[in-house]
Interface confidence: medium
Amino acid sequence: LCQGSKYSTCASCPSCPDHWMKYGNHCYYFSVEKKDWISSLEFCLARDSHLLMITDKQEMSLLQDFLSEAFHWVGLRNNSGWRWEDGSPLNFSRIYSNSLVQTCGAINKNSLQASSCEVSLQWVCKKVSP
């Protein structure tokens, strides 16, 4: 992940908006504040991005290295099975789901976890880099 001087110089970082981080062809935004799942989704959409949809284990592993114990909303919901917001199924990882009333997905450094959607958590947005 490229954010100014933490991993490389800004000269080598293709432009992502301020406070966003670059990885591969995408920009990621890690929130500091907390919102419920729907409000997090709306925040991302308003910035021409989407609530994080993870494409493979490699991306998930890299993002988890950056995360703490705190859970962050991702674009994952249980609508007759766990699906990302684009409709694709979750197929490269399991999600820890304890109750059928917990229908939204969150991630921390250790796992994907189901939660009640109205819980206020941090979140991650993702969009294609310019």
Epitope: D36, F71, Y96, N98, S99, L100, V101, Q102, A106, Q113, A114, S115, S116, E118, V119, S120
Partner: antibody
Framework: QVTLKESGPGILQPSQTLSLTCSVS??????????VGWIRQPSGKGLEWLAH???????WYELALKSRLTISKDSSKNQVFLKIANVDTADTATYFC?????????????????WGPGTSVTVSS | DVLMTQTPLSLPVSLGAQASISCKSS???????????LEWYLQKPGQSPKILIY???NRFSGVPDRFSGSGSGTDFTLKISRVEAEDLGVYYC?????????FGAGTKLELK
């Protein structure tokens, strides 16, 4: 498969301390969003919430009984405990533990999705 | 405390008939987050309560579709479209929006 099971002394005398244990399986007491609550029901009467404890050890009590109640847990043993000090005949009831699901408010919750079968407690001299 | 008033306290029904139970709260139980944490539980004789409905109208997993919940604000209703023998017992409404969480006194559904 989620299960909860309560255990207690059955009978005790007024002024003693009631100790109850809720043994759970099928989920972890330390998992984000999980909690366990205690509810009691005097014979032939309705349900009364007593206390609940969250995954991170945050505890909440029924205000009128707070001075007499202590809830705790041992996540490694999958057990939740409730102590009621200085019991009286009015504490005679069936005591249930139930799993509660976090929705963002520590003080209240919206789903008790699994319950134990209950344990009967009689306070008598 | 939010008082949850259930009516009737006893409801004699015939198998196959419809049953309707009312629950009124002493104040609005719309939570500050916009959700209404009103649930219905069924307690069969000698058993622990089991959740039927959460957040006013959502059926819990495995609950037959003959059970339906509705209402808003302070007035809520549980309907059973065609009562079966296994539905008999005491029904409790419950609010989790305000501290302390509170139950209704219960409605006993019994055979006529």
């Amino acid at each position: 498969q989620v299960t909860l099971k309560e255990s207690g002394p059955g009978i005790l005398q007024p002024s003693q301390t009631l100790s109850l244990t809720c043994s759970v399986s099928g989920f972890s007491l330390s998992t984000f969003g999980m909690g366990v609550g205690w509810i009691r029901q005097p014979s032939g009467k309705g349900l009364e919430w007593l206390a609940h404890i969250w995954w991170d050890d945050d505890k909440w009590y029924e205000l009128a009984l707070k001075s007499r109640l202590t809830i705790s847990k041992d996540s490694s043993k999958n057990q939740v405990f409730l102590k009621i000090a200085n019991v009286d005949t009015a504490d005679t009831a069936t005591y249930f533990c139930a799993r509660v699901i976090y929705y963002g408010s520590r003080s209240a919750y919206y789903s008790m999705d699994y319950w134990g079968p209950g344990t009967s407690v009689t306070v008598s001299s | 405390d939010v008082l949850m008033t259930q009516t009737p306290l006893s409801l004699p029904v015939s198998l196959g008939a419809q049953a309707s139970i009312s629950c009124k709260s002493s104040q609005s139980i719309v939570h500050s987050n916009g959700h209404t944490y009103l649930e219905w539980y069924l307690q069969k004789p000698g058993q622990s309560p089991k959740i039927l409905i959460y957040k006013v109208s959502n059926r819990f997993s495995g609950v037959p579709d003959r059970f339906s919940g509705s209402g808003s604000g302070t007035d809520f209703t549980l309907k059973i479209s065609r009562v079966e023998a296994e539905d008999l017992g005491v029904y409790y409404c419950f609010q989790g929006s305000h501290v302390p969480v509170t139950f209704g006194a219960g409605t006993k559904l019994e055979l006529k």
